[in-house]
Interface confidence: low
């Protein structure tokens, strides 16, 4: 046997060459013929009416042909013969790939609320062999759940993914990708999540700068709410108490002007949104104000006074449940 | 053998919108990105975008967001980009380019290029 | 971004001599193990042309006096020996990610 071919492996419109190569030649006849036998080259004549063909190299060692826009109907055995005696005969099988012809992702809901599952699908349609898919969120793979449908040696392949969302997960792509042997790189789609989540409260003491609140001082907190959607309402309640009356409420600002020892108590800012509500606490405590020395007569002293500052926040970030979490700054 | 025709040299005024073509041939149309480099007399080459013929899939370069809208028409095997709000500074040549790559991988680089369309801004 | 910075800004060689193109990427653009640097060619009214893809393989139809090289952030085009068609604008360009984007551009000229 001198007779000599290679399969071949190509994607679904490209080139496939098909090379019928003899070892040692004695010029006889080559002939190329498809899977139903019909003749496609004999040496440099073509009988086969299909322009797809062309002659690449006609020689009496190599008979090499082109397949231009291979389809699926070109896969099979194709037939090297060589008109030796006894004649010689060999073949190539030609394997066709084919991409997805799309990728389409379909999100149960467009907007989730946290701690909600939600189903994302992603359907690779039409390809050959069967698309693996491969789940991403953000840059973490996640695992799905895939059904492949077969049809006239086509694979439509869907994978299901079951994904419990966090507030975290905003804006973060949920990305399908797709592993195929006619698709080089990356090929995938995605869509980006869209979480809502209850507000997250955080009180700022802007003034005094220095956080020690002294009688007659001023005091200005602001409440910085942050949720999806945008809370709706921030409000300021004094708790078990009212609110001092010379106390000026502006938006997410609380001023107390003028402080005084009846003005200790503990202030919270209250946001909600439609997801739910959080609220947390400042602890006021009003210190009496800086005691003038008169100035010595005959004796010097020297004296050290060292003052503590007290900045005591608590924070409740979990709906309708009294503040438990304390965070304290001495 | 893969060719990309542009259309020809546009002549716009400040505020006008103008849309270029760029028809292929000689491969699948639908089966390869076609992105869009744009280059400013005597500068550099800059990458506005890519669609994907076959889902109209577009990603942008964001500094050309809000000022190229990327389109195809896989009918007629032809990739347009339309310029908004022009000014002077969008006056360049224009490149449509197919990627040299099977189906859509991003990792990738500038097979075959257009011979490019003069966009002139003046009032 | 993705900032390339191509040296020099220019330069000149004489006929037959060798030219030697940097490419410095802001980040790697290396992933598992291939580098997505590529370089192209452009004359002027021209479009550019692809001489070298994934960091050092030769275009078919391209002279193999071009010869590209380089890993991670660190290209090289090198055009060896330099012949009077070369003379051009060259940009080393990045497929690592979005946007991707072109160096700067050395411009060649031969004496």
């Known amino acids: 046997q001198n007779l000599f071919t290679k399969d071949v492996t190509v994607i679904e419109g490209e080139v496939a060459t098909i090379s019928c190569q003899v070892n040692k030649s004695d010029d006889s006849v080559i002939q190329l013929l498809n899977p139903n036998r019909q003749t496609i080259y004999f040496r440099d004549f073509r009988p086969l009416k299909d322009s797809r063909f062309q002659l690449l190299n006609f020689s009496s060692s190599e008979l090499k042909v082109s397949l231009t826009n291979v389809s699926i109907s070109d896969e099979g055995r194709y037939f090297c013969q060589l008109y030796t005696d006894p004649p010689q005969e060999s073949y190539t099988t030609i394997t066709v790939l084919v991409p997805p012809r799309n990728l389409m992702i379909d999100i149960q809901k467009d907007t989730a609320v946290e701690g909600e599952e939600i189903e994302v699908n992603c359907t690779a349609m039409a390809s050959k062999p069967a698309t693996t898919i491969r789940w991403f969120k953000g840059n973490t793979e996640l695992k799905g759940k895939s059904e492949v449908e077969e049809w006239s040696d086509m694979y439509t392949v869907t994978s299901q993914l079951m994904l419990k969302v966090h507030k975290e997960d905003d804006g973060v792509p949920v990305i399908c990708q797709v592993e195929h042997p006619a698709v080089t790189g990356n090929l995938q789609t995605q869509r980006y999540l869209e979480v809502q989540y209850k507000p997250q409260v955080h009180i700022q003491m802007t003034y005094p700068l220095q956080g020690l609140t002294r009688e007659g001082d001023a005091l200005e907190l602001t409440c910085e709410a942050i949720g999806k959607p945008q809370p709706v309402m921030v409000t300021w309640v004094r708790v078990d108490d009212e609110m001092p009356q010379h106390a000026v409420l502006s938006g997410p600002n609380l001023f107390i002007n003028n402080l005084n020892k009846t003005d200790n108590g503990t202030y919270r800012c209250e946001a909600s949104n439609i997801v739910g509500k959080a609220h947390s606490d400042y602890m006021l405590y009003v210190y009496d104000p800086p005691t003038t020395i008169p100035p010595p007569t005959t004796t010097t002293t020297t004296t050290t006074t060292t003052t503590t500052t007290i900045l005591t926040i608590i924070t409740d970030s979990r709906a309708g449940e009294e503040g438990s979490i304390r965070a304290v700054d001495h | 053998q893969v060719q990309l025709q542009q259309s020809g040299t546009e002549l716009a005024k400040p505020g006008a919108s103008v849309k270029m073509s760029c028809k292929a041939s000689?491969?699948?149309?639908?089966?390869?990105?076609m992105h869009w480099v744009k280059q400013r007399p005597g500068q550099g080459l800059e990458w506005i975008g890519f669609?994907?013929?076959?889902?109209?899939?577009?990603e942008y370069n964001q500094k050309f967001k809000d000022k190229a809208t990327l389109t195809a028409d896989k009918s007629s095997s032809t990739a347009y980009i339309q310029l908004s709000s022009l000014t002077s500074e969008d006056s360049a040549v224009y490149y449509c380019?197919?990627?040299?790559?099977?189906?859509?991988?991003?990792?990738?680089?500038?097979?075959?290029w257009g011979q490019g369309t003069l966009v002139t801004v003046s009032a | 971004d993705i900032v390339l910075t191509q040296s020099p800004a220019s330069l000149a060689v004489s006929l037959g001599q060798r030219a030697t193109i940097s490419c410095k990427a802001s980040q790697s653009v290396n992933y598992d193990g291939d580098n997505y640097m590529n370089w192209y060619q452009q004359k002027p009214g021209q479009p550019p042309k692809l001489l070298i893809y994934?960091?050092?393989n030769l275009e078919s139809g391209i002279p193999a006096r071009f010869s590209g090289s380089g890993s991670g952030t660190d290209f090289t085009l090198n055009i060896h020996p330099v012949e009077e068609e070369d003379a051009a604008t060259y940009y080393c360009q990045q497929s690592y990610e979005d946007p991707w984007t072109f160096g700067g551009g050395t411009k060649l000229e031969i004496k």
């Open positions: 380019s197919r990627a040299s790559y099977y189906s859509g991988s991003s990792h990738a680089w500038f097979g075959f």
């Open positions: 000689g491969y699948t149309f639908t089966h390869y990105w």
């Open positions: 994934a960091a050092s």
């Open positions: 669609i994907n013929p076959g889902t109209g899939y577009t």
